[in-house]
Interface confidence: low
């Protein structure tokens, strides 16, 4: 039978595919349609009266390769509505009345490549809405009311085209969003509510590192008021996110480097693009002599292409290779002689191999921030025995182990913020007996192994914006005997018996050691309450009457899943203290 082709719809065959046109036929239910069996077809139900898609509505349409549901009044899609559409490649559901894309909305569409859902009223996209769409390349969501996107929404989605125009987005973080859209060819972001503050620095840097011809339309600031109407790409990083007060050695804790730009060495093979570097803070007297001295430019052979170099007195080189599209350290040729500081921030380095840094044994500072490093081969830093500062912030690291840091006997500062670190193995920091400052904020940590800080002379530790619900004092925090500053805020603290130890430990520290308030997330009645202000009896009823009850587990393995709300609120609350970009 020819199904609806003989009655309701107009059908024609083209290149072996049936085109079934049921546009503007007053159809109220998908079940009114029947199609010829066993041949691929495209179905258009454009401009009808559909208001809801019910479970199994399309189960009789198994050979559909394209379905157009645009310009209906669909307000809800039941779970399983698309069952049976395993061959579907294109789904158009634009100009409807959808308000939410649920976890199971697109269940059954495992071959979908193109999804058009613009001009609805979408405000919420649930965290796994697209997770099964492992072939989706084109996603059109413009002209909805999306205020934020859940973390990892596109983790398993190979998007090449994403249209987010005309929504209510204020920021797009790197971790959980930008990191997952590396294949993107076309990203449209105009007409949103972009808040041009520190939170947007990650997006700005990411856009700058994309091929210059790829972004269509400008990201225009909506707030703060003095930036309203300004184009993000034209704003200086330091005006969007002023660097905090100058810390020791005139470097801020987020790792932004205050360095003077040097002109390119005269070499026709070199990139002509000069890299803009964060301006010097005015109160950095220690750097002024260095800046005002005329810079000694080196002859070509000594400065690796595509970098700029500067001689640091009395000897040694500052090598500036920031934002030069470098994929591997082996791209730096010829290897420099006597390098002292090597800045490779904002490149596209994916991995670091044992052989990459063998010739750099004179380095005192290495900046690898804002790359894409996932793999750090054990022993990569083995030769860097003079290194004092290592920046690995803004990469894709997920696990830390002892082998990664072998050789770093003199390291004092280690910046690991804004990665996706979930696990730190026992003994990780043992190869660094001089480590004073450790930044691990904005990662995915839930636990720390016992004795992780044992024998490490840390004075500053930043564990802010992770996934800690508990943190044992015994064998972890009580090893921090030289501590002058610890950041623990913005974690989903579970204010129950297991946190009594932490509360007591905090109360013993001197006033300014804990930088900000530690707020409870659970249980519900203590949400947003300050830990230090709570009575121990509230945290752990009956504690006083049961003095033998242990208040700490030495290595508490937290099994609570990092819920999406937590993740959205914590890991992906973007930079409030400036991403190190330089």
């Amino acid at each position: 039978s020819r199904g609806s082709c003989d009655s309701l719809c107009n059908c024609e065959e083209k290149d072996g595919t049936m085109l079934i046109n049921c546009e503007a036929k007053g159809i109220k239910m998908v079940s009114e349609i029947s199609v010829p069996p066993s041949r691929p077809f495209q179905l258009s139900l454009l401009n009808n009266g559909l208001t809801m898609l019910h479970t199994n509505d399309f189960s009789g349409l198994t050979n559909a390769i394209s379905i157009h549901l645009g310009f209906n009044n669909i307000a809800d899609i039941e779970i399983g509505a698309f069952n049976g559409l395993g061959l579907l490649k294109q789904l158009h559901i634009n100009h409807n009345s959808l308000e939410i894309l649920k976890e199971d909305t697109f269940h059954g569409l495992e071959n979908l490549e193109f999804l058009q859902a613009d001009n609805n009223f979408i405000t919420v996209i649930e965290p796994s809405a697209f997770s099964k769409l492992n072939r989706l390349k084109v996603l059109i969501l413009n002209d909805n009311a999306i205020e934020s996107l859940p973390p990892n929404i596109f983790r398993f989605v190979p998007l090449t085209h994403l249209d987010l125009r005309g929504n209510q987005l204020q920021t797009l973080p790197y971790v959980g969003f930008l990191e997952h859209i590396g294949r993107i060819l076309d990203l449209q972001l105009e007409d949103n509510k972009w808040a041009c503050n520190c939170d947007l620095l990650q997006l700005k840097t990411w856009l700058e590192n994309m091929p210059p011809q790829s972004i269509i339309g400008d990201v225009v600031c909506n707030s703060p008021p003095f930036f309203k109407g300004s184009i993000l790409s034209r704003l200086k990083k330091e005006s969007i996110c002023p660097t905090p007060p100058v810390y020791e050695e005139h470097e801020d804790p987020s790792g932004s480097l205050h360095l003077a730009a040097t002109s390119s060495i005269n070499d026709s093979r070199m990139s002509t693009k000069t890299t803009s570097i964060l301006k010097l803070p005015t109160k950095a007297p220690g750097l002024i002599p260095y800046i005002t001295k005329p810079s000694t430019q080196l002859p070509g052979p000594y400065c690796p292409i595509p970098c700029n170099c500067k001689v640091l007195s009395p000897s040694g080189l500052l090598i500036h290779c920031q934002e030069r599209n470098i994929e591997s350290l082996s791209d730096l040729r010829p290897p420099p002689q006597n390098p002292r500081k090597l800045i490779l921030a904002g490149n596209i380095i994916h991995s670091l191999m044992k052989s990459d840094l063998v010739e750099y044994f004179t380095l005192e500072m290495l900046h690898l921030g804002n790359n894409r490093i996932e793999v750090l081969e054990e022993g990569s830093f083995m030769n860097l025995t003079r290194l004092q500062k290592l920046y690995l912030n803004g990469n894709h690291l997920t696990k830390l182990s002892k082998g990664m840091f072998l050789g770093l006997h003199n390291l004092e500062y280690l910046y690991l913020e804004y990665n996706a670190i979930k696990e730190i193995l026992p003994g990780t920091f043992n190869p660094m007996p001089k480590l004073k400052v450790l930044y691990l904020n904005n990662n995915l940590l839930q636990v720390l192994p016992p004795h992780i800080f044992s024998g490490v002379p840390l004075t500053k530790v930043n564990l802010k914006t992770n996934q800690f619900t508990h943190l044992p004092v015994s064998n972890i925090l009580d090893d921090l005997d030289l501590l002058t500053q610890i950041d623990l805020e913005d974690n989903p603290w579970d204010c129950s018996c297991d946190l009594v130890g932490l509360q007591q430990w905090i109360q013993k520290l001197s006033k300014n050691t804990v930088t900000d308030d530690i707020l409870c997330t659970s249980p519900g009645h203590l949400d947003k309450k300050e830990l230090k202000a709570l009575n121990s009896e509230i945290l752990c009823p009956g504690l006083v009457n049961n003095p033998s009850m242990p208040t700490q587990t030495s290595y508490l393995m937290v099994t609570t899943p990092a819920t999406t709300t937590n993740t959205a609120d914590t890991i992906l609350r973007s930079l409030t203290d400036a991403v190190p970009l330089s």
């Epitope: 084109v138 090449t160 085209h161 590396g182 294949r183 993107i184 060819l185 076309d186 091929p211 210059p212 011809q213 790829s214 972004i215 269509i216 990139s271 599209n325 596209i348």
Partner: antibody, heavy 117, light 107 residues
């Protein structure tokens, strides 16, 4: 100056495949997308697809999906377009063109592909 | 896909005259439209992008206007080398599509 140099003319039989190359010079190869556009004799221009030379990701026009493959070799700054299952209506001049916000600011000289039994 | 329609198909004019070419989109493409010139035996050349911006090295006699669905390319005073085929192209949505072309020939 920017130059896109394409491979020479090809004559193919129906059902065969053709692979056209486009060598870029005068700019940073991985910083600009490359598109392929074709023009049948006496006809207009038809966009075929795009490749990102940096990562290698591609997107093809629906019409060519399954028949076209675009690849690149960053070591030689060359992109390739392979079209399979050729039919007579694929006879055309094939151009590579550098992407400039989805417009085309530099074009190759074109490669004539003739499909004839 | 967005269909681009150019008119007229052919325009017969003399050197020094003003040429006005039209391009219409089947749906709004905002300002995201380009014009190309193609001389016989050559590859196309970008003239105008984003409806009204002249590409590098394009003489001032070429200008573009319009937004939404209706666009115009104007050549204020035709030079001998301007007799060619002109195409419009939208970049508002994928796939990228061209108009069928307008031939400007010598009268």
């Amino acid at each position: 100056q920017v130059q896109l140099v394409q491979s020479g003319a090809e004559v193919k039989k129906p059902g065969a495949s053709v692979k056209v190359s486009c060598k870029a010079s005068g700019y940073t190869f991985t910083s600009y997308y490359m598109h392929w556009v074709r023009q049948a004799p006496g006809q207009g221009l038809e966009w075929m697809g795009i490749i990102n030379p940096s990562g290698g990701s591609t997107s093809y026009a629906q019409k060519f999906q399954g028949r076209v493959t675009m690849t690149r070799d960053t070591s030689t700054s060359t992109v390739y377009m392979e079209l399979s299952s050729l039919r007579s209506e694929d006879t055309a001049v094939y151009y590579c063109a550098r992407g400039f916000t989805r417009y085309f600011d530099y074009w190759g000289q074109g490669t004539l592909v003739t499909v004839s039994a | 896909e967005i269909v681009m329609t150019q008119s007229p198909g052919t325009l017969s004019l003399s050197p020094g005259e003003r040429a006005t070419l039209s391009c219409r989109a089947s749906q709004s493409v905002s300002k995201y439209l380009a014009w190309y010139q193609q001389r016989p035996g050559q590859a196309p050349r970008l003239l105008i992008y984003d409806a009204s911006n002249r590409a590098t090295g394009i003489p001032a006699r070429f200008s573009g206007s319009g937004s939404g669905t209706d666009f115009t390319l104007t050549v204020s005073s035709l030079e001998p080398e301007d007799f060619a085929v002109y195409y419009c192209q939208q970049r508002y949505n994928w796939p990228l599509t061209f108009g069928g072309g307008t031939t400007v020939e010598i009268k």
